[in-house]
């Protein structure tokens, strides 16, 4: 019962986490204009992984995609890659975990197979969560670096009279969504791995029996049957887990009208 609850909870937590990772990846507010200690502008700038937006106090909002792929900063490309890998792994993990749920019966699937699938999905969730956390953290680090750089020359004098205000960017809502979502996916993955230990069946070991056939003196010693290891003598109570195949057959694609500003 506890195993089923742990597995179910792990699945739900991971599902929420992956939904959050998807939401964060699609959100436009990865970085937002810093309003603290800045002149009050009638224009508010914010940027996402895919486009940058400007909201005017009139209510008019305009977003422009990053039309170039090669012209984008390597760090931004890396963040995009990490988030997409996180989503793909998470989606595959969700698919695998659905079939691994103890409360769902699919044909005559054995508990050992469900244990393997639970472990596989758990590992996928952990990696997915780590990808999201890494992606968000890389972006946050990039923001902090740029923030202090722009603070150093916040006002650039032009001819001594005219001043140009440097727009500084700070953490946007997407970063917090990404961190929380990544953490949830990670926790869900750990819960799945814990549930897997309880799912793996305890092996029944049979005593070896000698059959004496007339005219032959051959002893047959059948070992415990194991789906994962084949036939053979197995006196130790070993639990063998198969990591399962990992395929990246699901690639998330986004509209590519992107031009970094």
């Amino acid at each position: 019962m506890a195993v089923t609850a742990c597995q179910g909870l792990g699945f739900v937590v991971s599902l929420i986490g992956i939904a959050g990772i998807i939401a964060a990846t699609c959100m436009d507010q990865w970085s937002t204009q810093d309003l603290y200690n800045n002149p009050v502008t009638a224009v508010f700038n914010y940027q996402g992984l895919w486009r940058s937006c400007v909201r005017e106090s009139s209510g008019f909002t305009e977003c422009r995609g990053y039309f170039t792929l090669l012209g984008l900063p390597a760090m931004l490309q890396a963040v995009r890659a990490l988030m997409i890998v996180g989503i793909v792994l998470g989606a595959i993990g969700l698919l695998v975990s659905i079939f691994a749920l103890k409360c769902i019966r699919i044909g005559s699937m054995e508990d050992s197979a469900k244990a393997n699938m639970t472990l596989t999905s758990g590992i996928m969730f952990i990696v997915s969560g780590l990808c999201a956390i890494a992606g968000v953290s890389v972006f946050a680090n990039m923001l902090v670096t740029n923030f202090w750089m722009s603070t150093a020359n916040m006002y650039t004098g032009m001819g001594g009279m005219v001043q140009t205000v440097q727009t500084r960017y700070t953490f946007g809502a997407a970063l917090f969504v990404g961190w929380v979502a990544g953490g949830l996916t990670l926790i869900g993955g750990v819960m799945m791995c814990i549930a897997c230990r309880g799912l793996a069946p305890e092996e029944t070991n049979y005593k070896a029996v000698s059959y004496h056939a007339s005219g032959h003196s051959v002893a047959y010693k059948p070992g415990g049957f194991k789906a994962s290891t084949g036939f053979g003598s197995n006196t130790k109570n070993k639990k063998i887990y198969d990591g399962g195949a990992r395929t990246e057959d699901e690639v998330q694609s986004y509209p590519s009208k992107h031009d970094y500003v």
Partner: antibody, heavy 118, light 113 residues
Framework: EVQLVESGGGLVKPGGSLKLSCAAS????????VSWVRQTPEKRLEWVAT????????YYLDSVRGRFTISRDNAKNTLYLQMSSLRSEDTAMYYC???????????WGQGTSVTVSS | DIVMTQSPSSLTVTAGEKVTMSCKSS????????????LTWYQQKPGQPPKLLIY???TRESGVPDRFTGSGSGTDFTLTINNFQAEDLAVYYC?????????FGAGTKLELK
């Protein structure tokens, strides 16, 4: 057709109060940011206050902050400017305006005159 | 506050000529997020409220004749009236629409020669 009609202006003594109203029609008032702009007798234009749509952020000219309050009633499609502690320098023609792309003021009312004099 | 300086304060013109007026701001009105300049031009005729002519420094408001052209970036802006007509006699104001408080220039008054 977009229409902005101001009312509530008049003659008031220094230190007195006045409430200006602006009835809007011909556009979705609740989705628009609206402002008050005044024109002094010397014909200088001076932005006074802005109230945004949605969460209704308010912005004020420094010299009127704390004395003037901009507000809106989306149900009545009406913009207000509550003016108190009036000074002689507040004497002007007050226009109700709608903010457009680029924060430009694309529609203006005919204005209501406010005279602060003893 | 942003100071908007318009020049000249008045200009005597004749019908058909090209009219140019300038507006300078004390700070750049260029927004890096969308590369747009938040400067607006208005026309005010006697006894009327101001009328929007140009926003984003160069985008003509619908219904405004194409003889009106806005140009410039950062801190220096220009309004040009090609083939000036008698109906264009008015005071022209520029406005900072980037920083609060939104500030106006003192205006350029066009008078007929």
């Amino acid at each position: 057709e977009v229409q902005l009609v101001e009312s509530g202006g008049g003659l008031v003594k220094p230190g007195g109060s006045l409430k200006l109203s602006c009835a809007a029609s011909g556009f979705t008032f609740s989705n628009s940011a609206v402002s008050w702009v005044r024109q002094t007798p010397e014909k200088r234009l001076e932005w006074v206050a802005t109230i945004t749509s949605g969460v209704s952020y308010t912005y004020y000219l420094d010299s009127v902050r704390g004395r003037f309050t901009i507000s809106r009633d989306n149900a009545k499609n009406t913009l207000y400017l509550q003016m108190s502690s009036l000074r002689s320098e507040d004497t002007a023609m007050y226009y109700c305006t709608r903010q457009f792309k680029g924060n430009a003021l694309d529609y203006w009312g005919q204005g209501t005159s406010v005279t602060v004099s003893s | 506050d942003i100071v908007m300086t318009q020049s000249p304060s008045s200009l005597t013109v004749t019908a058909g000529e090209k009219v140019t007026m300038s507006c300078k701001s004390s700070q750049s009105l260029l927004n890096s997020g969308n590369q747009k300049n938040y400067l607006t031009w208005y026309q005010q005729k006697p006894g009327q409220p101001p009328k929007l002519l140009i926003y984003w420094a160069s985008t003509r408001e619908s219904g405004v004749p194409d003889r009106f052209t806005g140009s410039g970036s950062g801190t220096d802006f220009t309004l040009t009236i090609n083939n000036f007509q008698a109906e264009d006699l008015a005071v022209y104001y520029c406005q900072n629409d980037y920083f609060y408080p939104l500030t106006f220039g003192a205006g350029t008054k066009l008078e007929l020669k």
